[in-house]
Amino acid sequence: GITNINCSGHIWVEPATIFKMGMNISIYCQAAIKNCQPRKLHFYKNGIKERFQITRINKTTARLWYKNFLEPHASMYCTAECPKHFQETLICGKDISSGYPPDIPDEVTCVIYEYSGNMTCTWNAGKLTYIDTKYVVHVKSLETEEEQQYLTSSYINISTDSLQGGKKYLVWVQAANALGMEESKQLQIHLDDIVIPSAAVISRAETINATVPKTIIYWDSQTTIEKVSCEMRYKATTNQTWNVKEFDTNFTYVQQSEFYLEPNIKYVFQVRCQETGKRYWQPWSSLFFHKTPETVPQVTSKAFQHDTWNSGLTVASISTGHLTSDNRGDIG
């Protein structure tokens, strides 16, 4: 970068090289060139010569002033016009940065995705800082009082094998950059309560020829958790509002869920599960589309993520239903 150049003088920034966005700043340039009493000192920002707000302080030094500086990064350098020199002579350069101190991290969440072997912790970092910001995740055992710290620039995966201090922990996050430091509230977790079952996947759909045609959605999960609660949401693709069916599920078998749908309409389905009574849900599964036939012949739709599916034994799900509107993903 610009900081690696050989200098014939000195460039510095007040209040600092990294400063809060929107501040007034001064950049000083002091020449120390042999056999040169500079006629003029020039400042350049990102290679473009600055024309205004330059003050000559003394024979060797000048100041460039910026009001309300809003650029996240800029490369500054200054030059001197020396007598008998045809070209400007480079004095020195510096990279400057502006940004914000970190917000207090909130919404700290730690989950263990089944089979992952990791505890994944995430948080809301708040507003963009524009400058290098690091996070230290503190994990303290409530049984042994032992504390571990993990440095990261976003989220963190912590191997469950390294969590040797029992099942109960406090987790908190410290955010720090050149402009400040903040700490989140402490989150208390129990490792058995934060497991999210292996992803539920919709594999196929078929509409059965009957007096009232019915659509069967086939879905499954590789989870070994015994008590699992799931939700399947569905709607016509032209609708804003989701219908939601709830299921208490045993994944010993591929699940079959029945729906009575309008003919000749494209529907979209998603499923998600959680360990019954626990706090965290899986993210919704991939969007699965199925168009019901115009009349009654049997129609099959396969999930785009599977070519074939070994359905094995099947069991009909018992469900209850309600409506929900997810207006972020749809118009609303």
């Epitope: 032209t238 979209v268 993520q305 993903g329 118009i331």
Partner: antibody, heavy 117, light 107 residues
């Protein structure tokens, strides 16, 4: 088969209004959204808004809200987009398209609107 | 509004080559992305919806992938009829903005 028919071109004077039509056929008109897009010369596509003929629900891109009014005539399976207070900036190709909340699956050929005195 | 940054803006390729066009969303759009082909004098054509789903009658040489903020459209073994302009569009909260387009030209 599904078809959306639009007039090929419209020539209007600055300050006037124009109503661009989009006649649908080959499907149940009231069961899909009709979307409107434009493409200015040498530019990309912009989504203007949509209307659901089954309930006359509309959604507008904020940028076009004061410029555009979307309507339908169910008896003729036709959607309309009215553009008001026209300027040369409104000169563009305007497309209608059938769609849902995941895709626009059938498009009209586009109407070239020229605003010129 | 969500911005869709499409790249490259143009691509000069030969018949038989494989091309990949990418779209980056300014925030997570949860696979709510669609790809279209525009050709001079023809109606725009839907190719892929919801990131990975091939539209009816679209040849299998077209495929979509991606998640979060990064998505791509791949065209295997390009045919002469595939030249034109390609657009991505998100469907995650209005306005449903388009990418800037990728013009596929014959080398």
């Amino acid at each position: 088969q599904v078809q959306l028919q639009q007039p090929g071109a419209e020539l209007v004077k600055p300050g006037a209004s124009v109503k661009v039509s989009c006649k649908a056929s080959g499907y149940t008109f009231t069961k899909y959204w009709i979307n409107w897009m434009n493409q200015r010369p040498g530019q990309g596509l912009e989504w203007i808004g949509n209307i659901y003929p089954g309930s006359i629900s509309t959604n507008y891109n904020e940028k076009f809200k004061s410029k555009v009014t979307l309507t339908v005539d169910i008896s003729s399976s036709t959607a309309y987009m009215q553009l008001s207070s026209l300027t040369s900036d409104d000169s563009a190709v305007y497309y209608c398209a059938r769609g849902d909340f995941y895709a626009l699956d059938y498009w009209g050929q586009g109407t070239t609107l020229t605003v010129s005195s | 509004d969500i911005q869709m940054t499409q790249s490259p803006a143009s691509l000069s390729v030969s018949v038989g080559e494989t091309v990949t066009i990418t779209c980056r969303a300014s925030e997570n759009i949860y696979s709510h992305i669609t790809w279209y082909q525009l050709k001079q004098g023809k109606s725009p054509q839907l190719l892929v919806y919801a990131s990975t789903n091939l539209a009816d009658d679209v040849p299998s040489r077209f495929s979509g992938s991606g998640s979060g903020t990064q998505y791509s459209l791949k065209i295997n073994s390009l045919l002469s009829e595939d030249f034109g302009t390609y657009y991505c569009q998100h469907f995650w909260g209005t306005p449903w903005t388009f990418g800037g387009g990728t013009k596929l030209e014959m080398k």
